[in-house]
Interface confidence: low
Amino acid sequence: LNTTVLQGMAGQSLRVSCTYDALKHWGRRKAWCRQLGEEGPCQRVVSTHGVWLLAFLKKRNGSTVIADDTLAGTVTITLKNLQAGDAGLYQCQSLRGREAEVLQKVLVEVLEDPLDDQDAGDLWVPEESSSFEGAQVEHSTSRNQETSFPPTSILLLLACVLLSKFLAASILWAVARGRQKPGTPVVRGLDCGQDAGHQLQILTGPGGT
């Protein structure tokens, strides 16, 4: 199984996308784990929602976020506030009962900001993870590509804002033309302050991101 090398700048976010056969992995949860040495078990960092149908919800563990688009066959992992201690070999896994199938091996390299002379030893931020949890040793290959589509929540918010502005402009135009009869209620349209916020909450899970 080929290893994908990804580089990120310390302090910034690194986005990892592992693609898989959506039909083959139907109903399976995904996990992101850190390899303990060349032959060691894979230390679980974060896994997708326990209910597979809710896998699109973002799950967070420390500075790592995971979300799975089960229809598109893409699981996305975001390593936020990348630190020197985050460098290492990781795996995207597909969980099947008590076994885990490796979707992709990812070598994360952290580049130090030349302006930041902070001692690398101080940059270690431990993540809550499970090192007991050895990845199943048998591997199967899968496609891998980088994707950088905006999250659904952002698109929804943008659409909501644009629609609200359009509705507001329409209403102002109608009022300006004097066609608004006294006592006629103003159309609320989408309440972006509430519904979109709630949608963001749903998409990021109760803990947010």
């Epitope: 303990l36 076994e99 809550e128 090192s131 949890e133």
Partner: antibody, heavy 117, light 110 residues
Framework: QVQLVQSRAEVKKPGASVKVSCKAS????????MHWVRQAPGQGLEWMGW????????KYAQKFQGRVTMTRDTSINTAYMELSSLRSDDTAVYYC??????????WGQGTLVTVSS | QSVLTQPPSVSAAPGQKVTISCSGS????????VSWYQQLPETAPKLLIY???KRPSGIPDRFSGSKSGTSATLGITGLQTGDEADYYC???????????FGGGTKLTVL
Amino acid sequence: QVQLVQSRAEVKKPGASVKVSCKASGYTFTGYYMHWVRQAPGQGLEWMGWFNPNSGGTKYAQKFQGRVTMTRDTSINTAYMELSSLRSDDTAVYYCARTGVIPFDYWGQGTLVTVSS
Amino acid sequence: QSVLTQPPSVSAAPGQKVTISCSGSSSNIGNDYVSWYQQLPETAPKLLIYDNNKRPSGIPDRFSGSKSGTSATLGITGLQTGDEADYYCGTWDSSLSAVVFGGGTKLTVL
């Protein structure tokens, strides 16, 4: 169902070596890591190391480095743990334990190794 | 001396609830998931709880686990005489690069 069956009890003299076996059944042997844990009489659990039956790769606890060797025979789905230069304080029950996505989910019944002159 | 600290013994009457604590540090419990194991007399350990609070199939919901900071707790409700055993917590220690266990807690059902 998953089973880990270990070899019978052994009595060894100080300085000798012992090789404990752990036969796996009910699952894909090469698909899971095998750990070895020991327990001295009346004492707690002590981790010795893990073993990758697929590649033969190992990681040993620092305390046992140089004295322990973990191997396997995939043709008979069996893992082995050999401990050399035995001392009296190596007297213990030695367990093999499987680890997949769930840690140490199945254990062998244990093998008592007695080191006595 | 074990890396993880457990009380040597706890006791309670049948039907009661008991908790067993497991204290560690930022390099083990604070940095990883905790598992709990039950060892009945003269038998091999058995997995009770993994990932801090998950039960393997076949483990009754009388057993529960939790974690906060660098400490973990095993809870047992509706105590039965068959629960008399030694209980061990375990996790990974990133400093030692090893699996570590607590010293074990002997549960006595009065």
